[in-house]
């Protein structure tokens, strides 16, 4: 479902991924480091910045972020 | 730097009303929703509803429907709760609050309202 | 509404002590948690959101940790102005819902 219009709740985190706020609506995630094999499953679509760097992804399937402009 | 200054204490009877102010500055006033607060003696903090001041929408908790109104003045940078009807257990410290994308990052310094006979 | 309970209600420790505040949401907030601290007479102030990112300003002896239900509030080394009430509060869903709070009192 959609997420209501709200200034106090806070955009999907992936767990572990550090996250901060990207102006009103976007949100800059950091999930370097952390030993992942793939991507985060719960992204946000407000995701503005995605870092993946330091992990162990070693493919992309095509459009491996559908829900991200 | 950023403040929000609220107006004074206030003592009230039961069924009248009150409007509390919150004057912003240091900030541009409609980049940020503005959320309040109360907390009554010695308990923990209630969330009443929060404010778009770029078009005034509202968020309310439902608990404080109906007699709890949320407001803003562009033009004077300044966000208002007006509670009507009081209630004894309406007493307590009302805060407001600016917020951005989903924390509280600064908070007034608080408005007591007691309601007594 | 998600209750949001915070534990213990009154922590005594001493100046350099370590200590860690609970807080345990009653259904799974994704991370979605900040906390607050706030001294009598002073406006509440943001310690960290997204369960683990300080706010500037905020000293690096706090952390916070937890994921699912359970967070983690921790202080690793006590200074004379920590001692204060610490909330925690989800951004999950409306309405927001804060913890009762635990108070951090000097031994």
């Known amino acids: 479902g959609s997420s209501p219009r709200s200034g106090v709740l806070l955009r999907g985190c992936p767990t572990h991924c550090h996250c901060e706020p990207d102006g009103r609506m976007l949100l800059r995630v950091d999930c370097s480091d952390l030993g992942l094999s793939e991507l985060p499953s719960n992204l946000s679509v407000f995701t503005s910045y995605l870092d993946l760097s330091m992990n162990n992804i070693s493919q992309l399937l095509p459009n491996p972020l559908p829900s991200l402009r | 730097q950023v403040q929000l200054v609220q107006s004074g204490s206030e003592l009230k009877k039961p069924g009248a009303s009150v409007k509390v102010s919150c004057k912003a500055s240091?900030?541009?006033?409609?980049?940020?929703?503005m959320q309040w607060v109360r907390q009554a003696p010695g308990q923990g903090l209630e969330w009443i509803g929060e404010?778009?001041?770029?078009?005034?929408?509202?968020n309310y908790n439902q608990g404080f429907t109906g007699r709890f109104v949320l407001s803003v003045d562009t033009s004077v940078s300044t966000a208002y709760l007006q509670i009507s009807s009081l209630k004894a257990e309406d007493t307590a410290v009302y805060y407001c609050?600016?917020?951005?994308?989903?924390?509280?990052?600064?908070w007034g310094q608080g408005t007591t309202v007691t309601v007594s006979s | 509404d998600i209750v949001m309970t915070q534990s213990p209600a009154t922590l005594s420790l001493s100046p350099g002590e370590r200590a860690t505040l609970s807080c345990r949401a009653s259904?799974?907030?994704?991370?979605?948690l900040n906390w607050y601290q706030q001294k009598p007479g002073q406006a509440v102030r943001l310690l960290i959101s997204?369960?683990?990112r300080l706010h500037s300003g905020v000293p690096a002896r706090f952390s916070g940790s937890g994921s699912g239900t359970d967070y983690t509030l921790t202080i690793s080394s006590l200074e004379p102005e920590d001692f204060a009430v610490y909330f925690c509060?989800?951004?999950?869903?409306?309405?927001?819902?804060f913890g009762g709070g635990t108070k951090l009192e000097i031994k």
């Open positions: 997204y369960r683990s």
């Open positions: 404010i778009d001041p770029s078009d005034s929408y509202t």
């Open positions: 259904q799974d907030i994704s991370n979605r």
């Open positions: 240091g900030y541009t006033f409609t980049n940020y929703w």
């Open positions: 609050a600016r917020s951005l994308s989903g924390y509280v990052d600064y």
């Open positions: 509060q989800q951004g999950n869903s409306l309405p927001p819902t």
